[in-house]
Amino acid sequence: QEGNHEEPQGGLEELSGRWHSVALASNKSDLIKPWGHFRVFIHSMSAKDGNLHGDILIPQDGQCEKVSLTAFKTATSNKFDLEYWGHNDLYLAEVDPKSYLILYMINQYNDDTSLVAHLMVRDLSRQQDFLPAFESVCEDIGLHKDQIVVLSDDDRCQGSRD
C-alpha cells in the first residue's frame, strides 16, 4: 500500500462552502483544550489556484474572532503548507465534499512537533455518522480515542456564525 491519498475527484472547488467542526484530536492535549491554539472552528472554505482558503472562528475573551487562513498547495496533491502557530504540513485524509472532511496537521512550533486532526461536516445533524471514520483515521496515524475531543454546540462559536 502506498501512502498517497488523492484530492477530491471533482477538485478542491467541491470543498467550498460552509462547514462545521465536530471533533479534534491531538497527541498534545493542550493544543485542543479550551483556549488551546488549535481549538478553532471552521466556518467556511473556498479554493482558488489549488490553494485552500478557510475562515475559522477563534474563541477570544468570550467572543469569537473570524480569521482567514490560506493553506498553500504543494507538489503532493493532498498536502498543503499552512502557517498557523508555527508551520503546518496539512493533509486531507478523507474527503466526501458533500458530507465530511478529515484533515490532519503535523505542526512544528519552535522545537516541538505535534499531530492535530480535525473532523468537519456539512450537516451537524449527521455528525455521529462520521465519528467512526475520524476515529479510524486517528488510530491509523497514532492518535488514541482518549485523545479525541468531540465538540459541543457551546464549543463551536455558534453565536458568531452568519
Epitope: Q1, E2, G3, N4, H5, N27, Y91, A93, Y104, I106, T113, S114, L115, V137, E139, D140, I141, G142, L143
Partner: nanobody
C-alpha cells in the same frame, strides 16, 4: 517488541534507483507507524519518511519528497523505501524504525534497525 532488519542498500550512480526493505519480526508491526531515517557521515540522524499503520498516510522530508516513496505490506511485516533520482547527498546509513505516531521526530520511534549503507556516486 519489534526486531527490524534492513536490506537493499548498496552503491549506485547519481540518477539511479534503489529499493530498501525492512523486515519486522514481533507481533506489533501492524500497530506501529513505520519510518525511515538516515545518517550521513559527520551529521546527525535525520527523518526521511514515515507511513501510517494501514499504509494509507505518509509523510516525507522536503529533501526527498517526489523522489522517494514509502510503502508497507502488513501481510509480510515489511516496509519499503523506493528511492529514485538519487543524488550524492543521499549517501548515508538508512535506518528503519517503528513507533506509535506519525511524526517526523526520532524520539517518537521506539525500535530501530541496525541500518543499511547507501552510497551514491557522482
Amino acid at each position: 517488541a519489534v526486531q527490524l532488519v534492513e536490506s537493499g542498500g548498496g552503491l549506485v550512480q547519481a540518477g539511479g534507483s534503489l529499493r530498501l526493505s525492512c523486515a519486522a519480526s514481533g507481533r506489533t508491526f501492524n500497530n506501529s507507524v513505520m519510518g525511515w531515517f538516515r545518517q550521513a557521515p559527520g551529521k546527525e540522524r535525520e527523518f526521511v519518511a514515515a507511513i501510517s499503520r494501514s499504509g494509507a498516510f505518509a509523510h516525507y522530508a522536503e529533501s526527498v519528497e517526489g523522489r522517494f516513496t514509502i510503502s508497507r505490506d502488513n501481510a509480510k511485516n515489511t516496509v519499503y523505501l523506493q528511492m529514485n533520482s538519487l543524488k550524492p547527498e543521499d549517501t548515508a546509513v538508512y535506518y528503519c524504525a517503528a513507533g506509535a505516531i506519525l511524526l517526523p521526530t526520532e524520539r517518537r520511534y521506539d525500535y530501530w534497525g541496525q541500518g543499511t549503507q547507501v552510497t551514491v556516486s557522482s
